[in-house]
């Protein structure tokens, strides 16, 4: 019994004066608490505590469940205890099978003994299975068996408390350990789509997937810069132990333009937090925006190829696309495809492939596209660059020499005179008249130029060269002069094409 200095309050004394008492089942328990300031007896075991205000605690026929700690407390709050074992061969263990362990912490298997004199008090696996090799435990007959530093691998471990009684192993009821994992990483969050584009009145629904080791992970949808509570629905699954998945679905049944914004799926656990965002854009009606990928005025050389390329944004999806030239629709030579295979893609590409263009194929090429809400179009003006072609070269009745050339860009006509038999015609002759004629072809066709000189200026035999040229090339025509006496006897025109 405890001893204290005189004058100080002392704890109560208990009879019998020992820390532990063993009685047989059916026998009497009689405990006496002596103290001038006696207050109460308290009994504790597993799931219950009982109180008794009498200084003598009497249990006439002891049962196994009377096993436990009996504490006497006085008015000073000082106490003394005795632990009573009620030995019952039919009930060696008192049990509470609720067994939870936090990863890396200790947990108590509550199977206190009713008989402290049994041996080999320990844990055993169910169905004869061995316990995990690294499982360490400390037995305490009055409390149970403490498992040290619970591992995640022990989750759903089935075990029994075990003792040897008279040479035989006796097992308690089974315990199943449920391990609550420690969070050692932030949750993994992902979103069904990174961006959404909707028309007013359409339903917005987005799903966030949260993955973590347990359902204790917290998650929520938040609207950035807003405190409004969002309506979300949950589905969740345990894909085996410590592989938990939750899907949090946010829905706005009839989206409005002012619902546009950034929505964040936020998740956290005791380790940290993670988030992912999705952007909602709500438009009052659909749209199409076309972006030419090349200049809308195109110059191309005769016989060469050109690709007319547009990118366009269309929402909702484009329904009809066509390329038109001279009121005719192309049935082939073009392709239309989405810019990306992304589910939320609204950008598309259309390409018209024009091959070996002729001078007659210049003009306006138009791309038209429509969806359920709008139509849009873009025009390309295609000019085909052609080398000049000399259409006519004549001596007119009035003595003028006339040269008419066609090409694109507009040809320039220069005149040269070559005296005698010289091949090189370097002396230039100024034209008397130069006119650009209206072409009867399409507005993007060749331009026709007419130039004239006065042949009376030539006094000697020789050759007159009419040279038509532009950026693409040049072409020449020649007039041969031969004098007999004072008369120009012959003028023989011929052409020479110079590449």
């Amino acid at each position: 019994q405890p001893s204290v200095s005189p004058g100080e309050p002392s704890p109560p004394s208990i009879h019998p004066g020992k820390s532990d008492l063993i009685v047989r089942v059916g026998d009497e328990i009689r405990l006496l608490c002596t103290d001038p300031g006696f207050v109460k007896w308290t009994f504790e075991i597993l799931d219950e505590t009982n109180e008794n205000k009498q200084n003598e605690w009497i249990t006439e026929k002891a049962e196994a469940t009377n096993t436990g700690k009996y504490t006497c407390t006085n008015k000073h709050g000082l106490s003394n205890s005795i632990y009573v074992f009620v030995r019952d061969p039919a009930k060696l263990f008192l049990v509470d099978r609720s067994l939870y362990g936090k990863e890396d912490n200790d947990t108590l298997v509550r199977c206190p003994l009713t008989d402290p004199e049994v041996t080999n008090y320990s844990l055993k696996g169910c169905q004869g299975k061995p316990l995990p090799k690294d499982l360490r435990f400390i037995p305490d007959p009055k409390a149970g068996i403490m498992i040290k530093s619970v591992k995640r691998a022990y989750h759903r471990l089935c075990l029994h408390c075990s003792v040897d009684q008279e040479g035989k192993s006796v097992l308690s009821e089974k315990f199943i350990l449920k391990v609550r994992p420690a969070f050692k990483a932030v949750p993994v969050v992902s979103v069904s789509k990174a961006s959404y584009l909707l028309r007013e009145g359409e339903e917005f629904t987005v799903t966030c997937t949260i993955k973590d080791v347990s359902s204790s992970v917290y998650s929520t949808w938040k609207r950035e810069n807003s405190q409004t509570k969002l309506q979300e629905k949950y589905n969740s699954w345990h894909h085996g132990d410590f592989n938990y998945e939750r899907q949090a679905t946010l829905t706005i049944s009839s989206a409005r333009v002012n619902d546009s914004g950034v929505f964040m799926c936020y998740a956290n656990n005791t380790f940290g937090s993670a988030n992912v965002t999705t952007t909602l854009e709500v438009v009052d009606k659909g749209f199409i925006n076309i972006f030419p990928m090349i200049n809308t005025t195109v110059f191309v050389n005769d016989g060469e190829n050109v690709d007319l390329i547009v990118e366009y944004e269309a929402f909702p999806k484009p329904e009809h696309q066509q390329w038109i030239y001279m009121n005719r629709t192309f049935t082939d030579k073009w392709e239309d495809y989405p810019k990306s295979e992304n589910e939320s893609n609204i950008r598309y590409v259309s390409e018209l492939h024009l091959t070996r263009l002729k001078g007659t194929e210049g003009g306006t090429y138009t791309f038209l596209v429509s969806n359920s809400d709008v139509n849009a179009a873009i025009a390309f003006n295609v000019y085909v660059n052609t080398k000049p072609e000399i259409l006519t070269y004549d001596r007119l009745v009035n003595g003028m020499l006339q040269c008419v050339a066609a090409g694109f860009p507009e040809p320039t006509i220069d005149w040269y005179f070559c005296p005698g038999t010289e091949q090189r015609c370097s002396a230039s002759v100024l034209p008397v008249d130069v006119q650009t004629l209206n072409s009867s072809g399409p507005p993007f066709g060749k331009l026709v130029v007419q130039s004239s000189i006065d042949s009376s200026a030539f006094k000697h035999n020789g050759t007159v060269e009419c040279k038509a040229y532009n950026d693409v090339g040049k072409t020449s025509a020649y007039f041969n002069f031969a004098f007999k006496g004072n008369n120009k006897e012959q003028i023989h025109p011929h052409t020479l094409f110079t590449p």
């Epitope: 504790e44 597993l46 799931d47 219950e48 505590t49 009982n50 049990v95 509470d96 099978r97 609720s98 939870y100 936090k102 912490n105 509550r110 169910c126 169905q127 759903r156 089935c158 089974k174 199943i176 609550r180 347990s214 359902s215 204790s216 345990h238």
Partner: antibody, heavy 117, light 111 residues
């Protein structure tokens, strides 16, 4: 014997918070998990969460996450459940329940929380 | 989460009748042959009362006319001979996996 005695009925305005208490007696308070369950009028039972014995760890039903906090005061053997941002849907009877030997063996008498503008 | 579906939702019976209520779980609630399924009785204005724990164990103080059976996903509560005080609502509950869940309830009424 084991008893769980809950605080009295409450009337709250939408957006407010409520804190329900559950005073335990008749057992070693720190040795047992305390669960909270609610029941809306005419509806079934709904598990809200648990505060584990010993270290005070909690686990909440995701439905209430971010709005619910479960705590204990071991000096008075009392468990508390606070629910924030109340709406009319939170009108219910709230129960505390002690888990022993794998089941909810003891229940409080219930606390009616009415949320009304 | 594990969804528990009780049937029937309501039931009319007479004193002395044998009554069976079933509870089906969306996934197994068993671990090592132990079924983490429990049955509760609730009367109007009262807290639920535990009847059967771990599928088939009768809670102390509960009359023996109540019994439970089943494993895995299918469970049954049987009342062998209805007494007037048995007219109440009955709930199954699983605590195999968080979040713990209850069935929607079966209301047992006097015919």
């Amino acid at each position: 014997q084991v008893q769980l005695v809950q605080s009295g009925a409450e009337v709250k305005k939408p957006g407010a918070s409520v804190k329900v208490s559950c005073k335990a007696s008749g057992y070693t308070f720190t040795s047992y998990n305390m669960h909270w369950v609610r029941q809306a009028p005419g509806q079934g039972l709904e598990w809200m969460g648990v505060i584990y014995s010993g270290n005070g760890d909690t686990s909440y039903n995701q439905k209430f996450k971010g709005r619910v906090t479960m705590t204990t005061d071991t000096s008075t053997s009392t468990a508390y459940m606070e629910l924030r941002s109340l709406t009319s849907d939170d009108t219910a009877v709230y129960y505390c329940a002690r888990e022993r030997d794998t089941r909810f063996g003891n229940w409080g008498q219930g606390t009616l929380v009415t949320v009304s503008a | 989460e594990i969804v528990l579906t009780q049937s029937p939702s309501s039931l009319s019976a007479s004193v002395g009748d044998r009554v069976t209520i079933t509870c089906r779980a969306s996934e197994s609630v068993d671990i090592y042959g132990e079924s983490f399924m429990h049955w509760y009785q609730q009367k109007p204005g009262k807290a639920p009362k535990l009847l059967i724990y771990l599928a088939s164990n009768l809670e102390s103080g509960v009359p023996s006319r109540f019994s439970g059976s089943g494993s895995g996903t299918d469970f049954t509560l049987t009342i062998s001979s209805l007494q007037p005080e048995d007219f109440a609502t009955y709930y199954c509950q699983q605590n195999n996996e968080e979040p713990y869940t209850f069935g929607q309830g079966t209301k047992l009424e006097i015919k």
